[in-house]
Interface confidence: medium
């Protein structure tokens, strides 16, 4: 008789990424008997929750349950019922909630409390909702991409998983851009990490890693735009802000109260003689870049070297995976190819920003205007952040790989978070057994 495989013995896990601009739910799956192997966990589903980030529900917490319903119901459908009770659910909130907590711990707790109560109503094994630190966000992103790239595996493969993967075991650095914060995480080359807050030590699969990480709160793309507007309106002669980061012909009215709502603009706050102002786009990449550079204070550094705002940064080392908004923005702009040099990216940005708004709307008719209008700023901000903020150069640009997914799983902090909380990354290299992982009868 023919050998027949036993029914698959799999496990599932759910992580909700409660970001500043939206929430996404990820479902992961792995073979139960291979839990400690590297690279066996993969993403089977991503569900984007309709609506803004959870921090925006501060005045309407009663709507949080409905907000989460669709994606939680989707998880119910995807995961077999027999597995529901043993499927862990984790929610991690990032910089949007960190900012809310800075304003009011009480309000942040109230939002998280309602989120927890809503998620507890589902038949899964809910493990809690919490605001993760910027350091965790950076570290888990780094773990995710290196786990998916097979960098923690001791068995050097003769084949390559992805085009930019080298067969060596040198880890990739992680560059993560969100709406409210951005993270840089990598293993420096024989370099002392001068600031203890930026140093992490891991032992993974029998190998020690000394990792540098920092999360820049308020330097995600959305908060950076608010910062830039608050900075520029200070010197505007009236309620018209001629802005080089928006396309020529673009107009938008902004409430001053909205501008000063976020803690990120506090340093630029001043009494203005108007309640509203109008952004008028002039579409000039070079001027936009110059304006963005004013957000980075590079004149103060209490260490041997800094990124900006007095934050220690060792010399860059190795290849980097740039994901989340780094990828989404560059993908939209068609600039993720390995062959596109930094000079080419700059040239394309100059052309893109200079295109009239009416022309842009016609060319990208399917894209929401709110998002469409901000790609010139976001693309320019990415270049400014990588070049002036993190000190990549035109030459080292080739070491940046814009990554959306690796082997079908999204690059981001959520997978690393789940791997850690489910103890699926052992400190020591698992002993290989002489038996095959597949059992046949």
């Amino acid at each position: 008789t023919q050998n027949k495989a036993l029914p698959e013995n799999v496990k599932y896990g759910i992580v909700l990424d409660a970001g500043s601009s939206h929430t996404s739910l990820y479902i992961y799956k792995w073979p139960a008997e291979k839990e400690n192997d590297t690279g066996v966990v993969h993403q089977v589903e991503e569900c984007r929750v309709k609506g803004p980030g959870i921090s925006k529900f501060v005045q309407k917490v009663n709507e949080i349950g409905i907000y989460l319903t669709d994606c939680m119901e989707r998880a119910r459908e995807v995961i077999p019922r027999s597995q529901h009770q043993e499927t862990p659910v984790y929610l991690g909130a990032t910089a949007g909630m960190r900012l809310l907590r800075m304003e009011s711990e009480e309000l942040a707790d109230r939002v998280l409390d309602v989120v927890e109560r809503s998620l507890s109503n589902y038949p899964f094994d809910f493990q809690g909702a919490r605001i993760i630190t910027g350091q965790e966000e950076g570290a888990y992103g780094w773990i995710t991409i290196n786990y998916l790239l097979g960098k923690f595996s001791q068995k050097t493969r003769w084949f390559s998983i992805v085009p930019y993967e080298t067969n060596n075991q040198e880890t990739f650095g992680a560059l993560d851009l969100g709406g409210a914060s951005t993270q840089v995480t990598f293993v420096p080359q024989n370099q002392t990490i001068e600031s203890p807050d930026n140093a992490l030590q891991f032992r993974l699969y029998g190998k020690d890693y000394n990792v540098y990480t920092h999360s820049f709160l308020c330097y995600g793309k959305d908060q950076a735009l608010w910062q830039k507007l608050a900075k520029d309106i200070q010197v505007a002669s009236n309620e018209i802000l001629r802005d080089p980061c928006f396309h020529p012909g673009y107009k938008k009215v902004v409430n001053v109260s909205d501008l000063y709502k976020t803690p990120c603009t506090k340093r630029f706050e001043m009494t203005l003689p108007f309640q509203q102002f109008e952004i008028q786009g002039i579409g000039n990449y070079q001027q936009c870049h110059q304006s963005i550079l004013e957000l980075f204070n590079t004149s103060y550094c209490p260490y041997s070297q800094c990124a900006f705002n007095g934050i220690f940064l060792p010399p860059l080392q190795g290849d980097f995976g740039a994901f989340s908004a780094f990828y989404f923005v560059m993908k939209f702009l068609n600039l993720t190819s390995e062959k596109v040099s930094q000079e080419k990216v700059t040239e394309m940005m100059k052309k893109f920003c200079a295109q009239p708004w009416e022309e842009i709307k016609t060319s990208y008719a399917g894209v929401k205007e709110k998002y469409l209008s901000e790609y010139c700023f976001s693309g320019t901000y990415i270049l400014s952040l990588l070049l002036q903020g993190y000190h990549f150069t035109a030459d080292s640009w080739e070491h940046i790989h814009f990554i959306g997914k690796i082997q079908g799983s999204d690059a981001g902090w959520t997978l690393g978070y789940m791997l850690n909380l489910t103890n699926m990354i052992p400190a020591e290299q698992p002993l290989s057994t002489p038996l095959s992982h597949s059992t046949y009868v």
Epitope: Q290, L313, P314, L316, D395, S396, H399
Partner: antibody, heavy 123, light 108 residues
């Protein structure tokens, strides 16, 4: 110790070509850029371009793209610059200099220079 | 290209005098990308100050550098005869790499 030893002075005719060399010692040749810089008599410094011997990538100042060709020989740790279609405007002292490659430093500065090679274009 | 404008083009200072040379950059650059070189006649340039304010090996502590954005300077707290030379600022923020036109400093 680190040294960049350049070839001797050259007297060449207009329209001809010249190749000058820069022999590196005291460091890992493939771990640094080799730059070339021009200085006309009594004038300032002008960057021509660099070559990275590790992967022989080159970067040129657009102004010198049609004039200079940079090469490197890893086996002898030597960088070369060929100047073609020479005119009196090319009469100058040419320096080679090294600077650290990505991942080795935070500051990209030309930390060691050759002694310079004088090129005189005259009929 | 990024233009670096040095001033003054020439100056003479007495021994013990404080000297400041400025370098104005046409675009905002990161301070880590602004360097100074010293060149004496008939010799090759020497790295003098890197990343705006870090003294290269062997440079006397009477030299200092400062600045950010588009405005940078090199200062000698007390001029000495051996400081007579031409000083160049240089940027590596964008291509092509560019140098200032130089400041020739003489001893009175």
């Amino acid at each position: 110790q680190v040294q960049l030893q350049q070839s001797g002075p050259e007297l060449v005719k207009p329209g001809a070509s010249v190749r000058i060399s820069c022999k590196a010692s005291g460091y890992t040749f493939t771990g640094y850029y080799v730059h070339w810089v021009k200085q006309r008599p009594g004038q300032g410094l002008e960057w021509i371009g660099w070559i990275y011997p590790g992967n022989v990538n080159t970067k040129y100042n657009e102004k010198f793209k049609a004039k200079a060709t940079l090469t490197a020989d890893k086996s002898s740790s030597t960088g070369y610059m060929q100047l073609s279609r020479l005119t009196s405007e090319d009469s100058a002292v040419y320096f080679c200099a090294r600077s650290p490659y990505y991942g080795t430093t935070y500051y990209y500065t030309m930390d060691y220079w050759g002694q310079g090679t004088s090129v005189t274009v005259s009929s | 290209e990024i233009v670096l404008t040095q001033s003054p083009a020439f100056m003479a200072a007495s021994p013990g005098e404080k000297v400041t040379i400025t370098c104005s950059v046409s675009l905002i650059i990161s301070s880590r990308n602004l360097h100074w070189y010293q060149q004496k006649s008939e010799t090759s340039p020497k790295p003098w100050i890197y990343g705006t304010s870090n003294l290269a090996s062997g440079v006397p502590v009477r030299f200092s550098g400062s600045g950010s954005g588009t405005s940078y300077s090199l200062t000698i707290s007390s001029m000495e005869a051996e400081d007579a030379a031409t000083y160049y600022c240089q940027q590596w923020s964008d291509y092509p790499l560019t140098f200032g036109s130089g400041t020739k400093l003489e001893i009175k």
